[in-house]
């Protein structure tokens, strides 16, 4: 906390300029008018204020705007944003995408900080939904952003926004998140033809149900093993050997290398061994020939 002291004669700042870097911290406090600072915030970034001088400037803005900064000031915070706490940011009402971009630019190249997470949260809540332009912006700065959201938060993503999503944006999503995103992606891409559709939907298939996988198996999509391994186990189990063969196409040979890993392992256990043998891959662990398989879950559903 800087003491309140009178500004020395002739040192009162008439504008925010580089001469201020040679002021002592108490002189900045005493000689820089907070309202002047607020109107000339865009200049601060171009002036090499020290780490602690920026604390003084922040303190002045905090006194001027105890209820939170107006967006006209927020948009020009620049590196002063790094001095803000999540508590400060919770007082803000950020509605402009330009403001959001300007502040994300300051943090570019760094991990998402608590400040940035709070800023994004405030922005998205203010907008009511995660629209395409916002999602475009956020995933450009933070590819893992989408997967940091809860399934509940993801439910506010409109299908039209899915066009902004790149495969790498989904790398860290878990099945619960893909369960929410997949139906939106299916809706978003529904008017595309077979091969184009598969290219777009592929990253989201970790949320696909069995019937959709069966439908894909009829379209010669040649799904790669990496995608297959990310499918929901419960969606893969009911697929027949013939359906998996059609789904994977030439990639079916990769099943051998994955036979001990889910979902391949669990799927093998559900197939008849003689069906598995037709693949000629040496997959073992299927149901021996002559055994009857009772689907108890179906029986329970009927009773």
């Amino acid at each position: 906390e800087v003491e309140k002291t009178a500004c020395p004669s002739g040192k009162k700042a008439r504008e925010i300029d580089e001469s201020l870097i040679f002021y002592k911290k108490w002189e900045l406090e005493a000689c820089v008018d907070a309202a002047l600072l607020a109107t000339q915030m865009d200049r601060v970034n171009a002036i090499p204020f020290t780490y602690e001088q920026l604390d003084v400037l922040k303190h002045k803005l905090d006194e001027l705007y105890p209820q939170g900064y107006p967006e006209s000031v927020i948009q020009h915070l620049g590196y002063l944003f790094l001095k803000m706490s999540p508590e400060d940011i919770r007082k803000w009402n950020v509605t402009s995408l330009e403001t959001l971009k300007a502040l994300l630019e300051v943090n570019k190249g760094h991990e998402m900080s608590p400040q940035v997470a709070t800023l994004i949260d405030r922005f998205v809540k203010g907008r009511g939904q995660l629209d395409k332009d916002t999602l475009d912006t956020l995933t450009a700065f933070y590819p893992g952003y989408l997967c940091s959201l809860s399934p509940e938060e993801l439910s506010s993503v409109p299908p039209s926004s899915i066009w902004a999503v790149r495969p790498q944006d989904l790398d860290t999503c878990d099945p619960r998140q893909l369960d929410v995103l997949y139906p939106k992606a299916r809706l978003a891409f529904q008017n595309m033809n077979g091969s184009e559709y598969f290219v777009k939907i592929q990253s989201f298939l970790g949320g696909a149900p069995t019937e959709d996988l069966k439908a894909l198996s009829q379209q010669n999509v040649s799904m790669d093993l990496a995608t297959f391994m990310k499918l929901r186990t419960d969606a893969v189990l009911p697929l027949t050997v013939a359906e998996v063969q059609k789904l994977l196409g030439p990639h079916v040979e990769g099943l051998k290398a994955e036979e001990r890993h889910r979902p391949v392992r669990d799927w093998i256990l559900r197939q008849r061994q003689d069906d598995l043998d037709t693949l000629g891959l040496g997959l073992q662990g299927g149901i021996p020939n002559g055994y009857l398989v009772l689907d108890l879950s179906m029986q329970e559903a009927l009773s």
Epitope: T50, Y51, V106
Partner: nanobody
């Protein structure tokens, strides 16, 4: 213990160039602004150029604008001053400084390196 060690000074003819370096050790200087000051014989030490702790914003004294360029390499913890079109008036001991707080009283100083520009 924090140390700022300057190098690159020397004797150069008017119109020539020099590049000063300042190697910082003993701590991480990521939140420190860094700068170059100089002191000519019989004169006070004066700021030459300053670079921000983040973002690369700079300050130059009017007398060196357009001739000198300050830069820093965060990975190497090193500050540079590229001096072109040198004049006899640039003759001085050049000091590297680092501060988190105030340029009127920097936290750390180097020992200085002599630059002499002959006419």
């Amino acid at each position: 213990q924090v140390q700022l060690v300057e190098s690159g000074g020397g004797l150069v003819p008017a119109g020539g160039s020099l590049r000063l370096s300042c190697a910082a050790s003993g701590r991480t200087f990521s939140t420190y602004s860094m700068g170059w000051f100089r002191q000519a014989p019989g004169k006070e030490r004066e700021p030459v150029a300053v670079i921000s702790w983040i973002g690369g914003s700079t300050y130059y004294a009017d007398s060196v604008k357009g001739r000198f360029t300050i830069s820093r390499d965060y990975a190497k913890n090193t500050l540079y001053l590229q001096m072109n079109s040198l004049k006899p008036a640039d003759t001085a001991v050049y000091y590297c400084a680092a501060t988190k707080s105030e340029w009127r009283d920097p936290d750390y100083w180097g020992q200085g390196t002599q630059v002499t520009v002959s006419s």
